[in-house]
């Protein structure tokens, strides 16, 4: 039931991902299902807004980090990818696409420059970046 899937483009090492939808899913075809979430990595570089639109067109959103336990596979993600965290100037907060506010200690936020969007990096790090910069991205869909 569990199979080792090596996703060289996304993960730093071999990760154990359930491949049968009886244990997780349903998910769109070729997406990764893990602990009731569907994930897909897109290796074409887009700015944050284009990345968001791409995810939305597939009935998904950009990656939302909400639990280190339920999303422990994210520890192994390599490189940097757009996630759904964005600065809302009108109220000064950093929010996910669904409007929920980032829990202060869920991500280690690293600011290398001024920016209003964030990239996800391994071990639950978020890098502040200019939203117009092209980057790869991760889409996510909740199964429950």
């Amino acid at each position: 039931i569990w199979s080792a899937v090596f996703l060289n483009s996304l993960f730093n090492q071999e990760v154990q991902i359930p491949l049968t939808e009886s244990y997780c899913g349903p998910c769109p075809k070729n997406w990764i299902c893990y602990k009731n979430n569907c994930y897909q990595f897109f290796d074409e570089s887009k700015n944050w807004y284009e990345s968001q639109a791409s995810c939305m067109s597939q009935n998904a959103s950009l990656l939302k980090v909400y639990s280190k336990e339920d999303q422990d596979l994210l520890k192994l993600v390599k490189s940097y990818h757009w996630m759904g965290l964005v600065h809302i100037p009108t109220n000064g907060s950093w929010q996910w696409e669904d409007g929920s506010i980032l829990s202060p200690n869920l991500l280690t936020i690293i600011e290398m420059q001024k920016g209003d969007c964030a990239l996800y990096a391994s071990s639950f790090k978020g890098y502040i970046e200019n939203c117009s910069t092209p980057n790869t991205y991760i889409c996510m869909q909740r199964t429950v």
């Epitope: 000064g92 829990s103 202060p104 280690t108 600011e111 290398m112 001024k114 502040i128």
Partner: antibody, heavy 120, light 107 residues
Framework: QVQLKESGPGLVAPSQSLSITCTVS????????ISWFRQPPGKGLECLGV???????NYNSVFKSRLSIIKDNSKSQVFLKMNSLQTDDTARYYC??????????????WGTGTTVTVSS | DILLTQSPAILSVSPGERVSFSCRAS??????IHWYQQRTNVSPRLLIK???ESISGIPSRFSGSGSGTDFTLSINNVESEDIADYYC?????????FGAGTKLELK
């Protein structure tokens, strides 16, 4: 006009707790984060913690076990409470408004500060 | 924690001179550095944000440069009102820290 004003006890006995209020005007605490800093006499600035627009907080780990920051948006007030004060906590304490850019960012408006002396 | 080292500790200048303050970070922090001026018995005042961005109301003689680990604050044509302590602050990650400061004094 954007302003921040700290008010504190002035003198605190060793082992006692410190409470300081930061009252802001000219902007809303629902739109700007507020951070607390301190500066011992003749020394540099130290960041104690920050309270975000939604009420979440980050504390400097040096003070985490004895520091609390809360706020009342309707009264435009932010409160700092620090427990178990010692003489080396003697300092001028400032609140400051985080600028509206970036994540951790910079501090564009500062209060005048309140001097806290820890002595018996 | 990120350590910010400011040098020199004291700078002596004559009015009209150009002066530069150095701030070095213990690791690369991009452009996430900010500069403050603190006159005697006064609160800090933001001078420069994100290494080189100017602040409304701050005289144009103040400028900043640098990225990565090495940053510089410069004052062209120093005036007597510029006598103060100058601090750099990083915003790369929590906790935010400041340099120990550089004191600008008149010769």
């Amino acid at each position: 006009q954007v302003q921040l004003k700290e008010s504190g006890p002035g003198l605190v006995a060793p082992s006692q707790s410190l409470s300081i209020t930061c009252t802001v005007s000219g902007f809303s605490l629902t739109s700007y984060a507020i951070s607390w800093f301190r500066q011992p006499p003749g020394k540099g600035l130290e960041c104690l913690g920050v309270i975000w627009t939604g009420g979440g907080t980050n504390y400097n780990s040096v003070f985490k076990s004895r520091l609390s920051i809360i706020k009342d948006n309707s009264k435009s007030q932010v409160f700092l409470k620090m427990n178990s004060l010692q003489t080396d906590d003697t300092a001028r304490y400032y609140c400051a408004r985080k600028g509206d850019e970036g994540y951790w960012g910079y501090f564009d408006v500062w209060g005048t500060g309140t001097t806290v002396t820890v002595s018996s | 924690d990120i350590l910010l080292t400011q040098s020199p500790a004291i700078l002596s200048v004559s009015p009209g001179e150009r002066v530069s303050f150095s701030c070095r970070a213990s690791q690369s922090i991009g452009t996430s550095i900010h500069w403050y001026q603190q006159r005697t018995n006064v609160s800090p005042r933001l001078l420069i944000k994100y290494a080189s961005e100017s602040i409304s109301g701050i005289p144009s003689r103040f400028s900043g440069s640098g990225s990565g680990t090495d940053f510089t604050l410069s004052i062209n044509n120093v005036e007597s009102e510029d006598i103060a302590d100058y601090y750099c602050q990083h915003s790369n990650r929590w906790p935010l820290t400041f340099g120990a400061g550089t004191k600008l004094e008149l010769k």
